[in-house]
């Protein structure tokens, strides 16, 4: 008979295939983790449909200068479809994992610092555009909060533009028996000795791909164009459909670049819940669906993580 080990957290089964597996080009990837924390509302920032409050996350750029890189969308339910949307609105739940530990979990639940999806935005350079993603919250759910505290700075490459992107979040509160996510307890510490203890560690993955059946044109340099907004909305919805697990916290900074159309975005996951291989393979598995639903022919998928380490004390930026 086969060798059997006792299963961590107890044996559970589900009829759905929970792990998607597709090809990846092997990369030595390193992750950046940080605390998500809300700050004061930003005056004058543009909000998108479905939002009722826009908050900013302060990040430090690679040069060490403080840069405001995005919005936080709160849980204003909006079930109407976006004008011009080709599909149903993205389903967004604005809570992070529920306060009760899932059955079989070996650790306490993660505590969410904000009660809404957080935006982590890298701006684009002059050859590309980046604008607000239209996200509709169709469900509101309770989020856990921790006392307000000074946020830990974290760094992502900045391309010197001031067009922010709203994070599209799909952090769902789900039944552990159906998502089977109870096998990995929340991580509560960062990978860098100088960083503070984190109540919610997150990992950022930089994803890029080509849309080979589209040509880059000036409309994709201008976030105000319908073409830009529609393509960004389609890609946001695609991401939310692909990364359905509760540990996917959202996406940000969808950018378009020349070369057919090169799409770049940053995906945010709860730390310790996915590896660089699966981020890419899950996306790869849905290329066919993207082609049929959105008429997007996707190729040259690449995933790496936003470089680490960073220093919470010095604000050291991303190398290179």
């Amino acid at each position: 008979s086969g060798h059997t080990n006792s299963t961590p957290g107890g044996e559970k089964e589900t009829s759905a295939t929970q792990r998607s597996s597709m090809p990846i080009s092997t990369k030595n990837a390193v992750s950046m983790t940080s605390r998500l924390s809300s700050h004061s509302p930003v005056s004058g920032s543009s909000t998108t449909q479905g939002q009722d409050v826009t908050l900013a996350l302060a990040m430090e750029s690679a040069t060490g200068s403080a840069t405001t890189l995005g919005h936080v969308v709160t849980s204003a339910p909006d079930t109407s479809a976006a004008p011009g949307s080709t599909g149903p609105p993205a389903h967004v739940v604005t809570s992070a994992p529920d306060t009760s530990a899932a059955p079989g979990s070996t650790g306490p639940p993660a505590h969410v610092v904000t009660s809404a999806p957080d935006t982590v935005t890298s701006a684009s350079d002059s050859a590309s555009g980046s604008a607000s993603t239209l996200v509709h919250s169709t469900t509101s759910a309770r989020a856990t909060t921790t006392p307000a505290s000074k946020s830990t700075p974290f760094s992502i490459p900045s391309h010197h533009s001031d067009t922010p992107t709203t994070l599209a979040s799909h952090s769902t509160k789900t039944d552990a028996s159906s998502t089977h996510h109870s096998t990995v307890p929340p991580f509560t510490s960062s990978n860098h000795s100088t960083s503070p203890q984190l109540s919610l560690g997150v990992s950022f993955f930089f994803l890029s791909f080509h849309i080979s059946n589209l040509q880059f044109n000036s409309s994709l340099e201008d976030p105000s164009t319908n073409y830009y907004q529609q393509l960004q909305r389609d890609i946001s919805e695609l991401f939310l459909q692909i990364y359905k697990q509760g540990d996917f916290l959202g996406l940000s900074n969808i950018m378009f670049r020349p070369g057919s159309v090169v799409v770049q975005s940053t995906l945010v996951f709860r730390e310790g819940t996915t590896n660089v291989h699966d981020v890419e393979t899950q996306f790869n598995q849905r290329k066919t669906e993207a082609a049929s639903r959105y008429n997007l022919t996707i190729s040259d998928i690449s995933v790496r993580d936003v470089p680490f380490p960073f220093s919470a004390q010095t604000g050291a930026g991303v190398p290179g």
């Epitope: 080990n5 089964e13 929970q18 597996s21 030595n28 089977h180 096998t183 310790g272 680490f308």
Partner: antibody
Framework: QVQLVQSGAEVKKPGASVKVSCKAS????????MHWVRQAPGQGLEWMGY????????HYNQKFKDRVTITADKSASTAYMELSSLRSEDTAVYYC?????????????WGQGTLVTVSS | DIQMTQSPSSLSASVGDRVTITCRAS??????LVWYQQKPGKSPKLLIY???TLTSGVPSRFSGSGSGTQYTLTISSLQPEDVATYYC?????????FGQGTKLEIK
């Protein structure tokens, strides 16, 4: 209870192919990724690749990419690993190992191993 | 590829000793580090995953620690049944490489 039962020992000549089976029971076969790992005599463990039986997608270690084929028969809840163009250095115990379910990054159950001897 | 280097390659200790095995990854693997125990003639057995989470049924004398590129398996009080070879595994990115193993013997 979960069990992974592998096929029996094989002796093959260089240049031949071998196909090792791994029958799974005690869980939903299509829900868990199945990996293959080998261990040469007195040596360490070497990851070869995996199959997701739910989607039939495979991913291989580049070292074996041209010689290994991993398949799955859902109806029989069995995974297979075929290695072609065998050489003497392929003599090893071959294990199937189940990866824990969603967000579970470890092998929680292993087969008992299948010794493949390549000798002329 | 991420290379995993274990040290020592073998060690001999007395019953009751505290034993430490280290595993170094060539790149940050973000706690996606697994430890297995393999006894002679047997299949590997899962001990620890996510660098520090003990599998149910594994004695509490086993513990894991570390982050980034450096990880440690500790046996707080060595028992005769712990004689085995211990392997670490990178589960951050493919190929899911293993360390070369640490053979643990009783003096």
């Amino acid at each position: 209870q979960v069990q992974l039962v592998q096929s029996g020992a094989e002796v093959k000549k260089p240049g031949a192919s071998v196909k090792v089976s791994c029958k799974a029971s005690g869980y939903t076969f299509t829900t868990y990724t199945m990996h293959w790992v080998r261990q040469a005599p007195g040596q360490g463990l070497e990851w070869m690749g995996y199959i997701n039986p739910g989607s039939d997608y495979t991913h291989y270690n580049q070292k074996f990419k041209d010689r290994v084929t991993i398949t799955a028969d859902k109806s029989a809840s069995t995974a297979y690993m075929e290695l072609s163009s065998l050489r003497s250095e392929d003599t090893a115990v071959y294990y199937c190992a189940r990866q824990g379910n969603y967000a579970a990054y470890y092998f929680d159950y292993w087969g008992q191993g299948t010794l493949v001897t390549v000798s002329s | 590829d991420i290379q995993m280097t274990q040290s020592p390659s073998s060690l001999s200790a007395s019953v009751g000793d505290r034993v430490t095995i280290t595993c170094r990854a060539s790149g940050n693997i973000h706690n996606f580090l697994v430890w297995y125990q393999q006894k002679p003639g047997k299949s590997p057995k899962l001990l620890i995953y996510n660098a520090k989470t003990l599998t149910s049924g594994v004695p509490s004398r086993f513990s894991g620690s570390g982050s980034g590129t450096q990880y440690t398996l500790t046996i707080s009080s060595l028992q005769p049944e712990d004689v085995a070879t211990y392997y670490c595994q990178n589960f951050w990115n493919v190929p899911f490489t293993f360390g070369q193993g640490t053979k643990l013997e009783i003096k």
